[in-house]
């Protein structure tokens, strides 16, 4: 954690392991008002490394639904719609934070958890050409 | 939130707005032990839609450092290394959860926030608008 001077207006923490356990307000503030995330929603179909989105649901996790990308092909798609064997479709992965109910089924107690999700796919050259 | 029967072993919540504010254990559990996220770290350079990673730092946020992808080209890179302007490099975006210190500078009080981040880039066929 980052050492930040305590503000006198901060809520009190009675947790002896402070700041291991913190209070989190679940009223989500969405900073994406100026951006429309749906604008990228058709990329999965138009990409040269297209992907399908699979729903991953877990009621013990917040958010309970996460969408996982799975590349449709091992190779990339050429302009004519056929596979290019010389290029590979690969998933772009990102570590994200989720909240895991702990103890299980508790509505007001969570643990922070890092999970790796595939967000989409990109087309890469399989061989790195090393210059002598 | 999801209505889940309260488990008798759950921590008590004295917050009158329960379950708007919850307790979160910041000892992160990492579920990615079987996967090595670094293995995809060179895709940004080998992709036909390569990207650069920019560091976005905010001490009032957890995690404080987030890496943002910016596509290097408007078009996609061909096998010969030249840019194909008939195709478009576009960012793959994902909404992620972060914790925002609230009130500001408080070490143990946060609000959940959704932000949109660009994770990498993919090469897509442009939408051609046909004039009637």
């Amino acid at each position: 954690g980052i050492a930040i001077p305590r503000n006198s207006g901060c809520p009190n923490s009675e947790d002896k392991n402070f700041p291991r356990t913190v209070m989190v307000n679940l009223n989500i503030h969405n900073r994406n008002t100026s951006t429309n995330p749906k604008r990228s929603s058709d990329y999965y179909n138009r990409s040269t490394s297209p992907w399908n989105l699979h729903r991953n649901e877990d009621p013990e996790r917040y958010p309970s639904v996460i969408w996982e990308a799975k590349c449709r092909h091992l190779g990339c798609v050429k302009a004519d719609g056929n596979v290019d064997y010389h290029m590979n479709s690969v998933p772009i992965q990102q570590e994200i934070l989720v909240l895991r109910r702990e103890p299980r089924h508790c509505p007001n107690s969570f643990r922070l958890e890092k999970i790796l999700v595939s967000v989409g796919c990109t087309c890469v050259t399989p061989i790195v050409h090393h210059v002598a | 939130g999801i209505a889940i029967p309260r488990n008798s072993g759950c921590p008590n919540s004295e917050d009158k707005n329960f379950p708007r504010t919850v307790m979160v254990n910041l000892n992160i559990h990492n579920r990615n032990t079987s996967t090595n996220p670094k293995r995809s770290s060179d895709y940004y350079n080998r992709s036909t839609s390569p990207w650069n990673l920019h560091r976005n730092e905010d001490p009032e946020r957890y995690p404080s450092v987030i890496w943002e992808a910016k596509c290097r080209h408007l078009g996609c890179v061909k096998a010969d290394g030249n840019v194909d302007y008939h195709m478009n490099s576009v960012p793959i975006q994902q909404e992620i959860l972060v914790l925002r210190r609230e009130p500001r500078h408080c070490p143990n009080s946060f609000r959940l926030e959704k932000i949109l981040v660009s994770v990498g880039c993919t090469c897509v066929t442009p939408i051609v608008h046909h004039v009637a």
């Epitope: 091992l74 190779g75 050429k78 056929n82 290019d84 061989i127 | 293995r39």
Partner: antibody, heavy 120, light 107 residues
């Protein structure tokens, strides 16, 4: 039941030609990638050709490029390998193999193989 | 081309033994690895794809592991029908290439 049956192998002189066929049954042939893989006597496996589900993409390793041609007739559920300018080192059992996907990357079903012998 | 080096080239083992076969690629193949079993006079039979995914119908005593350049096929308890030659194959970079094979013989 998935079945792949190769035919067309035999003895041919160096410089000669041969056309192998692979008759497929028990699955929707037109939706699967197919390949030819060969195995020289007492040796390991070597990729010879790949073709995707509709014949729009093919690949050949340098060892056969310009001499061999893979094709398919989805209406006849048949895969072909046209082999020209045959050399002694092309002597092998030739297998046709199916990819569980559209394209031809790895192989979940194989034929019994047909022996091609190139010798004078 | 990516070179696939299998080891050992042959091994002798008894029924019930745990057997491990390794395959090393000349560069990272990003888990795009298949394992096959071949018996004399027969075509190869797919056991594993994607380095770890067991094909349907393949006994659970077979398992694949590894990442990057190094991969392993393990037979947890060797059965009489497992005496055969095993091949790995990479499908990351064309041309797809196979290892030289590992012959598993009865001790």
């Amino acid at each position: 039941e998935v079945q792949l049956v190769e035919s067309g192998g035999g003895l041919v002189q160096p410089g000669g030609s041969l056309r192998l066929s692979c008759a497929a049954s028990g699955f929707t042939f037109s939706t699967y990638g197919m390949s030819w893989v060969r195995q020289a006597p007492g040796k390991g496996l070597e990729l010879v050709a790949i073709i995707n589900h509709n014949g729009g993409s093919t690949f050949y390793p340098d060892s056969v490029k310009g001499r061999f041609t893979v094709s398919r007739d989805n209406s006849k559920n048949t895969l072909y390998l046209q082999m020209n300018s045959l050399r002694a080192e092309d002597t092998a059992v030739y297998y046709c193999a199916r990819d569980p996907r559209h394209d031809g990357y790895f192989f979940d079903y194989w034929g019994q193989g047909t022996l091609v012998t190139v010798s004078s | 081309d990516i070179q696939m080096t299998q080891s050992p080239s042959s091994l002798s083992a008894s029924v019930g033994d745990r057997v491990t076969i390794t395959c090393r690629a000349s560069e990272d193949i990003y888990d795009r690895l298949a394992w096959y079993q071949q018996k004399p006079g027969k075509a190869p039979n797919l056991l594993v794809s994607g380095a770890t995914s067991l094909e349907s119908g393949v006994p659970s005593r077979f398992s694949g592991s590894g990442s990057g350049k190094d991969y392993t096929l393990t037979i947890s308890s060797l059965q009489p029908e497992d005496f055969a030659t095993y091949y790995c194959q990479q499908y990351w970079s064309v041309p797809w290439t196979f290892g030289g094979g590992t012959k598993v013989e009865i001790k």
